[in-house]
């Protein structure tokens, strides 16, 4: 019973997890404009992996894709390479273990296949869930070298006279989204994994023996026994996981059509 | 077509408050902000603030801080100005914009003359 | 707050004529972002509240005459007219739209000879 639910409970924390790294790729807030200490601007910038925004006092917000893959800047690109490893291995594992889940029947699949395949999905989360961290880690450790970059010549001038104000970027409510939706894919895949040591049928065989009895000539020979995992054929009050998790989309909503910046 | 009526002029003396409204037709109100606009007489343009139609957010310049406020009556498509405790200083012509792209203020009321007199 | 300094004050110019004032702000109104310079252009007649010319620096209004050209970048920024009409005597006015307050230039008065 505990193996089942912590199967179905790794699973659902799993989707949850993998549906929080779909919605923060997909995010366009990786990073934000820095309000902090700037003049005040009617106008915010905000960029994704994909696409860089500008939203302005008025209402009018304007987003633009990086349609080059050349000039794109190699920690980006591998950023998103590792998102998309970590969404593929995510997926992957998903369908795996949902063929592995003790509360499934498909045909007459023996638990040691279970037990594997609960384990194969199990390491997918946890790569994708380091996939995502990773990325997300990544960008962030991008961010902060170039707020402090942009911080050290915050302010260029021509004499001193004109001023030219340098946007800094801070951390993005994706990078949220990424390092908590990675951890809860990892924290699932450790639970699979777990999952799968109570799954795996352990063969405790012993010996036959032969008791030899006065009179009579009747061996009782013990057949090799299972280890009691506590799930037997008995399939009478079976606890059923549907793991119907409700995925949130994670992505933001502003608070008005123009917001005030 | 898109019009801003804005309301009469005014006359006033000084201390007392005076509140000029702004009614918007031809444009969804809450999807634009709505921005005001001071001039005195044979003056430039001075920026008072905007207010945000959907969340009725305001902000006002640092010149117009305390005496000058904002609202929305987004039933009646309507934004106002009220200005209190009145100085001749505020004798002018008040316009009400709509700020649109490029934080551009595209459309403009015809003005409401507030004179200060006592 | 940002300054806004137009120039110059006043034009005196015949029909026909091309014209050039200038607007200069204290800060860099181009946004890194979408490499927008957020000034914005409006002519304002005797009477009347003003209108607006372009924004976005040099993108046009609908319905203005393409007569009417905004450039520059940064700091420095320039409306022009190729041809002057009579009904283009009025005062030109250049606004920050990219830090609060959305200050105003002082103007540019145009007038015919």
């Known amino acids: 019973m505990a193996v089942t639910a912590c199967q179905g409970l790794g699973f659902v924390v799993s989707l949850i997890g993998i549906a929080g790294i779909i919605a923060a790729t997909c995010m366009d807030q990786w990073s934000t404009q820095d309000l902090y200490n700037n003049p005040v601007t009617a106008v915010f910038n905000y960029q994704g992996l994909w696409r860089s925004c500008v939203r302005e006092s008025s209402g009018f917000t304007e987003c633009r894709g990086y349609f080059t893959l050349l000039g794109l800047p190699a920690m980006l690109q591998a950023v998103r390479a590792l998102m998309i490893v970590g969404i593929v291995l995510g997926a992957i594992g998903l369908l795996v273990s949902i063929f592995a889940l003790k509360c499934i029947r498909i045909g007459s699949m023996e638990d040691s296949a279970k037990a594997n395949m609960t384990l194969t999905s199990g390491i997918m989360f946890i790569v994708s869930g380091l996939c995502a961290i990773a990325g997300v880690s990544v960008f962030a450790n991008m961010l902060v070298t170039n707020f402090w970059m942009s911080t050290a010549n915050m302010y260029t001038g021509m004499g001193g006279m004109v001023q030219t104000v340098q946007t800094r970027y801070t951390f993005g409510a994706a990078l949220f989204v990424g390092w908590v939706a990675g951890g809860l894919t990892l924290i699932g895949g450790v639970m699979m994994c777990i999952a799968c040591r109570g799954l795996a049928p352990e063969e405790t065989n012993y010996k036959a023996v032969s008791y030899h009895a006065s009179g009579h000539s009747v061996a009782y020979k013990p057949g090799g026994f299972k280890a009691s995992t506590g799930f037997g054929s008995n399939t009478k009050n079976k606890k059923i996981y549907d793991g119907g998790a409700r995925t949130e989309d994670e992505v933001q909503s502003y608070p008005s059509k123009h917001d005030y910046v | 077509q898109i019009q801003l009526v804005q309301s009469g002029p005014e006359l006033r003396k000084p201390g007392e408050t005076v509140k000029i409204s702004c009614k918007a037709s031809g444009f969804p109100f809450t999807t634009d902000g709505m921005s005001w606009v001071k001039q005195a007489p044979g003056k430039g343009l001075k920026w008072m603030g905007w207010i945000n139609t959907y969340s009725g957010v305001p902000t006002y310049a640092d010149d117009f801080k305390g005496r000058v406020a904002f609202s929305l009556e987004t039933s009646a498509s309507t934004a106002y100005l009220q200005i209190k405790n009145l100085k001749n200083e505020d004798t002018a012509t008040y316009f009400c914009a709509r700020f649109r792209r490029g934080n551009a203020l595209d459309n403009w009321g015809q003005g409401t003359s507030v004179t200060v007199s006592s | 707050d940002i300054v806004m300094t137009q120039s110059p004050s006043s034009l005196t110019v015949t029909a026909g004529e091309k014209v050039t004032m200038s607007c200069k702000s204290s800060?860099?109104?181009?946004?890194?972002?979408?490499?927008?310079?957020?000034l914005t252009w409006y002519q304002q007649k005797p009477g009347q509240p003003p209108k607006l010319l372009i924004y976005w620096a040099s993108t046009r209004e609908s319905g203005v005459p393409d007569r009417f050209t905004g450039s520059g970048s940064g700091t420095d920024f320039t409306l022009t007219i190729s041809s002057v009409q009579a009904e283009d005597l009025a005062i030109y006015y250049c606004q920050n739209n990219y830090f609060y307050p959305l200050t105003f230039g002082a103007g540019t008065r145009l007038e015919l000879k």
């Open positions: 800060q860099s109104l181009l946004n890194s972002g979408n490499q927008k310079n957020y």
